[in-house]
Interface confidence: low
């Protein structure tokens, strides 16, 4: 399967998305931290990055919870996480991020 | 359902490399990590390390020099190697998912002992 | 590396008393904490995760609680399937596990 990521908001800063299965989807925030946002960002080109809360709720899938990185993968995919769709949350708990050079 | 098992030789001569095979069912290694972690007799936990999802791999950076984990996803296995192994490597082998940074699910685990 | 401090090293309980078991870590951990019961001869079992979510299929009369550097594991009431070693262990910054704390039966 295909899996790309994009932010919602702006270029730079807003709502963590990553597209899987032919859908857009949200990550849930559980243990969503700096080191996360520093991978999710990297994906995009960026250099560094943070986390962010309150980020406004998205819609559909929330495809990823428990996401756990070290801040030293190249991608989320190499993070442990939970399975694809596997999550206990809700969309008040969208995940952010805003990303820099 | 998930199931972890630890398989390899019972006893290893000093000096010598200890290789391990994790096998698991019930679930893809290409979408968890799975982690080693050992036990001396009558001691503690200590992790070992680890090969992510993504086929990444982490070390115990006291363990790093002699320690390689590596995988083979159509066996659905998990190898360990270390080498010049001394007594101290005593113990018992667990292999264990792990999820969200907890290790959710756990093999029963293989006693190694290191002795001539 | 992140220190664990577990207390006590050994304790003693009767069935239906509430048990307290603590870890500290030598600097903040942002809550990965979790909690690990190992009984005699089997591997260790999730309890609790992320300091204070219970693992299915745990009975609620383990619960955890903490944040920062302090964090404690609750029996409410000690049953004797309890009898068993309890590790805390920290996956912030690195993978770290207690020494344990022994449960026993007065």
């Known amino acids: 399967n295909s899996v790309s990521v994009r932010i919602v908001g702006s270029s730079n800063r807003g709502r963590a998305e990553v597209y899987y299965s032919g859908t857009w989807g949200t990550i849930c925030d559980d243990e969503w931290d700096n080191s996360d946002a520093i991978v999710f960002c990297r994906m995009l080109g960026y250099s560094k990055g943070r986390a962010l809360s309150s980020v406004g709720a998205g819609t559909g899938q929330i495809w990823l919870d428990n996401v756990q990185c070290r801040g030293t993968e190249s991608t989320l995919w190499s993070c442990t996480k939970n399975s694809w769709g596997h999550h206990d949350c809700s969309h008040e708990e969208d995940a952010g991020v805003e990303c820099s050079v | 359902q998930v199931q972890l098992k630890e398989s390899g030789p019972g006893l290893v001569q000093p000096s010598q490399t200890l290789s391990l095979t994790c096998t698991v069912s019930?679930?893809?290694?290409?979408?968890?990590?799975l982690s080693w972690v050992r036990q001396p007799p009558g001691k503690g936990l200590e992790w070992i390390g680890a090969i992510w999802g993504g086929d990444n791999t982490d070390y115990n950076s006291a363990l790093k020099s002699r320690l390689s984990i590596s995988r083979d996803t159509s066996k659905s296995q998990v190898l360990l190697k270390m080498n010049s192994l001394q007594t101290e490597d005593t113990a018992i082998y667990f292999c264990?998912?792990?999820?969200?940074?907890?290790?959710?699910?756990w093999g029963q685990g293989v006693m190694v002992t290191v002795s001539s | 590396d992140i220190q664990m401090t577990q207390s006590p090293p050994v304790l003693s309980a009767s069935v239906g008393d509430r048990v307290t078991l603590s870890c500290k870590t030598s600097?903040?951990?942002?809550?990965?904490l979790d909690w690990y019961q190992q009984k005699h001869g089997e591997a260790p079992k999730l309890l609790i995760y992320y300091t204070n979510n219970l693992q299915t299929g745990i009975p609620s009369r383990f619960s955890g609680s903490g944040s920062g550097t302090d964090f404690t594991l609750t029996i409410s009431t000690l049953q004797p399937e309890d009898v068993a070693t309890y590790y805390c262990?920290?996956?912030?910054?690195?993978?770290?596990f207690g020494a344990g704390t022994k449960l026993e039966l007065k």
């Open positions: 262990y920290q996956y912030d910054s690195g993978f770290t």
């Open positions: 264990t998912r792990e999820l969200g940074g907890s290790f959710d699910y």
């Open positions: 019930g679930f893809s290694l290409t979408s968890y990590t």
């Open positions: 600097q903040n951990i942002n809550k990965k």
